[in-house]
């Protein structure tokens, strides 16, 4: 399920590169599945904001982007995530590239990685 | 029932390492829900969290950062037991040790205590 | 670190009292905060989780309330078995701080 999961954040960030006109060139921080959960594309100076991930949701491969970004660029989201919220992780789009998650997985979702048995 | 009983020696040297060791009842540190924690508590620093020890398909490990350079959190699978190491020890690490298990609902906290133990640094 | 701080330290009250103990964190803490109680010579217990949850087996006299960076824990009709002392502490950043505590005396 793991990775049906990371297959479908793929066809999302290229989608997303499409939207948003990346290319490896281009400066920012590219999509990635940090093997939790998906992070789309972002611009330096963006902070984008995820929820925790159920563990075990299927993924619809038509769903809306499931993060919210605060900066210059805005992907239309429908979710108004929160750092105030429960459950929501944070990394910003930095000129090094994604700082490390905030706050780490496993303090705002209750486990920091896949287990290999599940 | 789950039970959390510590033991080790109340009196260590400064510059010793002072080890603790926390028996489980009623639970397993092997058990993939929980956290294995070590707090202390002292007049001058109040309750302070150490760190801890936890199973997700491999052992991992958090510490705090005040004393990351010293401790070592170790599970014991067959004896469902987990210890506290500290090194270097100085009179500011005298305390009153607590082991506790960590349960996540919304978020980590700490639902069943051991005992606690006086842990005097002296010479 | 984020730091905890309490109010008041200490709090003088009568059985069947309503006291409110206030937790204020230095930095947003969303709902990542857990309430104890210790009574001398003992461990601390878990009362309230996550802000507002009460654990099991506690009595509904207690409550807690609030989040991002300002909480209360409330014991409503305060019995005698209840005069300890209170710790609120933030579970979301390492290291999980404690505040320095809370007091309650019989008055």
């Known amino acids: 399920i793991f990775k049906k999961e990371q297959a479908m954040c793929l066809e999302k960030i290229q989608r997303a590169n499409e939207l948003m006109g990346f290319n490896d060139s281009s400066p920012g921080c590219p999509g990635m599945w940090d093997n939790i959960t998906c992070w789309k594309p972002a611009h330096v100076g963006e902070m984008v904001l995820v929820s925790c991930p159920e563990l075990f949701r299927i993924f619809n491969p038509d769903q809306v982007w499931e993060t919210e970004t605060i900066g210059e660029s805005d992907f239309g989201d429908s979710n108004s995530l929160d750092l105030s919220d429960m459950g929501v992780v944070s990394r910003n789009c930095t000129e090094d590239g994604w700082s490390e998650p905030f706050p780490h997985y496993f303090d705002a979702c209750g486990f920091d990685e896949y287990e290999s048995e599940t | 029932q789950v039970q959390l009983q510590q033991s080790g020696p109340g009196l260590v040297k400064p510059s010793q390492t002072l080890s603790l060791t926390c028996a489980i009842s009623?639970?397993?540190?092997?058990?993939?829900?929980?956290?294995w924690n070590w707090i202390r508590q002292s007049p001058s620093r109040g309750l302070e969290w150490l760190g801890r020890?936890?199973?997700?398909?491999?052992?991992?490990?958090h510490y705090a950062v005040s004393v990351k350079s010293r401790i070592t959190i170790n599970p014991d699978t067959s004896k469902s037991q987990f210890s506290l190491q500290l090194n270097s020890v100085t009179p500011e690490d005298t305390a009153v040790y607590y082991c506790?298990?960590?349960?996540?609902?919304?978020?980590?906290?700490?639902?069943?205590w051991g005992q606690g133990t006086l842990v005097t640094v002296s010479s | 670190d984020i730091q905890m701080t309490q109010s008041p330290s200490s709090l003088s009250a009568s059985v069947g009292d309503r006291i409110t103990i206030t937790c204020r964190a230095s930095q947003m803490i969303a709902r990542y905060l857990n309430w104890y109680q210790q009574k001398p010579g003992k461990a601390p217990k878990l009362l309230i989780y996550a802000s507002y949850n009460l654990q099991s087996g506690i009595p509904s006299r207690f409550s807690g309330s609030g989040s991002g960076t300002d909480f209360t824990l409330t014991i409503n009709s305060l019995q005698p078995e209840d005069f300890a002392t209170y710790f609120c502490?933030?579970?979301?950043?390492?290291?999980?701080?404690f505040g320095p505590g809370t007091k309650v005396d019989i008055k």
């Open positions: 502490q933030q579970a979301i950043i390492n290291p999980y701080t």
């Open positions: 020890t936890y199973y997700r398909g491999k052992w991992k490990n």
């Open positions: 009623g639970d397993s540190v092997s058990n993939r829900l929980a956290t």
């Open positions: 506790a298990r960590g349960v996540w609902i919304g978020n980590w906290f700490l639902d069943h």
